[in-house]
């Protein structure tokens, strides 16, 4: 059931990995045998060196044999392999990074944990912040909006920078920046609410740099199933960081007796992590894991990158699907605790809440479930994809589609179960969220497959922008608006408070189904778009004249 195309067995999975390893061994042997003849001329400005006759390029999903190019004596020909910086030369191979790659991925994942820990520490003490600054609900909404909007606007900018400049420096600067801003925000006097708003906006910019660029470094450190695994670890940081953020926020506040101290924990850890990134993360070349090393010198304009991404159907559909996930998680995260509290009021197992926070216990349970299902979802998704890759080349989008469609069913069941059983509702939330989160790492992997290394950061950024714009930037407000609209035409009662919110939340499973459809659409174009990306990668390894991206 997990694989819809299991019959069409394509070259993939374990056999593909073994074949790749064998090809790499043979190529390393050939490279060691090639001596420098001293005939290597200077490369043309901006030109990528060309390979030896019959050389193979390790791409995202296998190898492509290239036609012999270049006359003897030109950079990259067999006689110059040792000294030329062409593909024929000895490249810094993924294997040569050894344990360093694992450490780099671990540090990047830790950074992602801190990214979300910081974000949700603020969420964990938001009531205290609101109380301290005298923030109204519209003010709290403004804080959220400013964060998301600045994140959205900054993401494409960092995408552009990430495809053109030193990524680990940008990453570290981003971490140092949001750490400094968060730390400073813990000292903002009560009368300067606008400074708090500004600080959230600046933190959004800092965090956008990380969310946009870090996955592309992982993409350049690993390939195939290893990359899926590493991206899974990286994206598991989201629920882990979120959960830890809530815990950090409330526990530090209680221990120190002042919520201000909660905002001083993640910045300290952030500074340490930023330093570790500078030290331990290798300055990988774009396409490094794809055995392209120094070949990817070709630069395209931002406008050209955008055009190429918009024409990339797999990328567009997977981005729309990601927006659907974002829509659902944003809306459910905001409203489910209150919805379950209202369900308990209707069932007469809880009192009507007149003084917020309402459903604090439900928020805690929901947070714990989200944290665990995030982990379970990422593991399940990665595992299912690994297995399905043995059967079909379309495994990635199909696993996502099945996860989404399955999730929609269980999200629908939440509203059925909540009327009579809160435990039943929590079970549906658990299964629904696990399935919904199963596509986190896979979506990132899809992007790595269908987008060439030199525009991956831009792609991640644009996807991030789209998913926030069409997703969680508006979904919590839209649900609230629909709920209020329904309530206006009904009598004021606890039952209708519960029902109106439930009917409004029913929009989520429909959007999730739509997301599933977008993943199915991705599956239609995935193989051809992946092949096109590999072909473009090979073209990037040609002399400048032949580069057509």
């Amino acid at each position: 059931m997990m694989c819809l195309e299991c019959a069409s067995a394509a070259a993939g999975g374990a056999e593909e990995e073994e074949a790749d390893a064998e090809r790499r061994r043979r190529r390393r042997g050939a490279q060691r045998g090639a001596g420098g003849s001293g005939c290597c001329g200077a490369r043309g400005a901006g030109g990528a060196g060309v390979s030896a006759a019959g050389d193979e390029v390790q791409t995202l999903s296998g190898s492509v044999r290239r036609a012999p190019t270049g006359p003897p004596g030109t950079p990259g020909t067999p006689g110059c392999a040792a000294t030329a910086k062409g593909p024929g030369a000895q490249q810094p191979k993924p294997a040569s990074l050894g344990r360093g790659r694992g450490a780099a991925a671990a540090i990047l994942s830790l950074g992602n944990v801190l990214n979300y820990l910081d974000r949700y520490t603020v969420a964990g003490v938001l009531l205290d912040i609101a109380q301290h600054f005298g923030v109204k609900d519209r003010g709290a909404g403004l804080l959220q909006s400013v964060f998301i909007c600045s994140f959205m606007v900054a993401a494409p900018i960092f995408g552009y920078l990430g495809d053109r400049f030193n990524r680990k420096v940008i990453l570290s600067c981003g971490i140092f920046f949001w750490s400094a801003v968060t730390f400073s925000s813990s000292f903002i006097p009560q009368q300067y609410f606008w400074l708090l708003v500004l600080s959230r906006g600046l933190v959004g910019i800092g965090e956008a740099s990380y969310s946009t660029i870090a996955p592309t470094i992982i993409g350049d450190l690993f390939t195939k199933n290893t990359r899926t695994l590493m991206l899974s670890v990286f994206y598991f940081a989201i629920p882990l960081g979120s959960g830890l953020g809530y815990i950090t926020g409330s526990s530090v506040k209680q221990a120190a007796g002042d919520w201000h101290w909660a905002l001083r924990v993640s910045p300290v850890l952030g500074m340490i992590t930023g330093t570790l990134i500078l030290i331990l993360v290798p300055a990988t070349k774009r396409g490094h894991a794809d055995q392209l090393g120094d070949q990817l010198k070709a630069r395209t304009s931002w406008l050209r990158d955008m055009k190429a991404l918009i024409r990339n159907r797999s990328y567009v559909f997977s981005s729309l699907a990601t927006s659907a996930v974002s829509f659902a998680t944003g809306a459910l995260g905001m409203w489910i605790p209150l919805y379950l509290h209202r369900a308990q009021v209707v069932q007469k197992t809880a009192e009507t809440c007149n003084s917020p926070p309402c459903g604090a216990k439900d928020s805690l349970i929901f947070g714990a479930i989200t944290c665990f299902t995030g982990f379970l979802g990422v593991v399940t998704g990665a595992g299912a994809t690994r297995w399905c890759r043995l059967k079909t080349q379309r495994a990635d989008p199909l696993v996502c589609a099945v996860g989404m469609l399955g999730s929609a069913i269980f999200i629908c069941l939440i509203f059925v179960a909540a009327k009579s059983s809160i435990v039943g509702a929590y079970i549906c939330i658990f299964v629904g969220e696990t399935l919904l989160f199963s596509n986190w790492a896979i979506t990132a992997d899809i992007l790595m497959y269908v987008v060439i290394p030199t525009r991956r950061a831009t792609a991640v950024a644009l996807q991030s922008f789209t998913s926030h714009l069409l997703g969680d930037a508006g979904s919590p407000y839209l649900i609230g608006f629909i709920s209020d609209l329904i309530r206006q035409s009904t009598k004021d009662s606890p039952l209708w408070e519960f029902l109106s919110l439930g009917y409004a939340l029913m929009l989520c499973p429909f959007v999730v189904v739509l997301g599933g459809m977008f993943f199915l659409a991705t599956a239609l174009f995935f193989v051809s778009d992946r092949a096109r990306a590999e072909q473009q990668v090979n073209q990037l390894a040609m002399p400048p004249a032949s580069v057509k991206v």
Partner: antibody
Framework: EVQLVETGGGLVRPGSSLKLSCATS????????MSWVRQAPGKGLEWVAL??????????NYAESIKGRFTISRDDSKSRVYLQMNTLRDQDTATYYC????????????????WGQGVMVTVSS | DIVLTQSPPTLSVTPGESVSLSCRAS??????IHWYQQRSNESPRLLIK???QSIAGIPSRFSGSGSGTDFILSINRVESEDFSVYYC?????????FGPGTKLEVK
């Protein structure tokens, strides 16, 4: 011009109830946080209760000394704020001031920028 | 709860003199302190907000300073209408609390 006018004070016996009312004008009441502050004869000021605007779910906060006995409420359609005082004690004898918090649309100050003239509540047997 | 201590309880001055009234908080409260003046048989009125910010309609001879735990209300050349009780109030955390007041009287 901002105006706050308190009514409903008087002499009551311990254990009885009383409801104070504060009529307001000259500002957008529905957006504004309101408080009651009291002052016992010859003593200092003591904050009693705060009610936030509808945008903050009309959340109420109380001083520990009156929690569970007093209830603050508001009626935006009438631009009025109320203080329902139950189980009154001798030590509740004071002048009760209706106060307004300065409003900044997205947030509100916790200080009091306008005060009513006050209403006397005497609890005595 | 945050406790505010005002000193001195009573201050006797002659008109034209300049005075400083002190307010001390039991814990650090940044600049979340406000000053009120209450004349005899009148309602209090806001003089200074957030330790040092002036209020429209309040004479410029009133000024405030301080941060953390120690705050000062200064009156430059006291006038006859200034003889009244002055209260400080903290808004750093709920419950909102007032100081016991400082009575400014004619010497």
């Amino acid at each position: 011009e901002v105006q706050l006018v308190e009514t409903g004070g008087g002499l009551v016996r311990p254990g009885s109830s009383l409801k104070l009312s504060c009529a307001t004008s000259g500002f957008t009441f529905s957006d504004t946080w309101m408080s009651w502050v009291r002052q016992a004869p010859g003593k200092g000021l003591e904050w009693v209760a705060l009610i936030k605007d509808k945008n903050s779910n009309s959340e109420a906060n109380y001083a520990e000394s009156i929690k569970g006995r007093f209830t603050i409420s508001r009626d935006d359609s009438k631009s009025r704020v109320y203080l329902q005082m139950n189980t009154l004690r001798d030590q509740d004898t004071a002048t009760y001031y209706c106060t307004r918090h300065e409003d900044f649309y997205y947030y509100s100050g916790y200080y009091f920028d306008y005060w009513g003239q006050g209403v006397m509540v005497t609890v005595s047997s | 709860d945050i406790v505010l201590t005002q000193s001195p309880p009573t201050l006797s001055v002659t008109p034209g003199e300049s005075v400083s009234l002190s307010c001390r908080a039991s814990q650090g409260i940044s600049t979340s302190i406000h000053w009120y003046q209450q004349r005899s048989n009148e309602s209090p009125r806001l003089l200074i907000k957030y330790a040092s910010q002036s209020i429209a309609g309040i004479p410029s001879r009133f000024s405030g300073s301080g941060s953390g735990t120690d705050f000062i209300l200064s009156i430059n050349r006291v006038e006859s209408e200034d003889f009244s009780v002055y209260y400080c109030q903290q808004t750093y955390s709920l419950p909102l609390t007032f100081g016991p007041g400082t009575k400014l009287e004619v010497k």
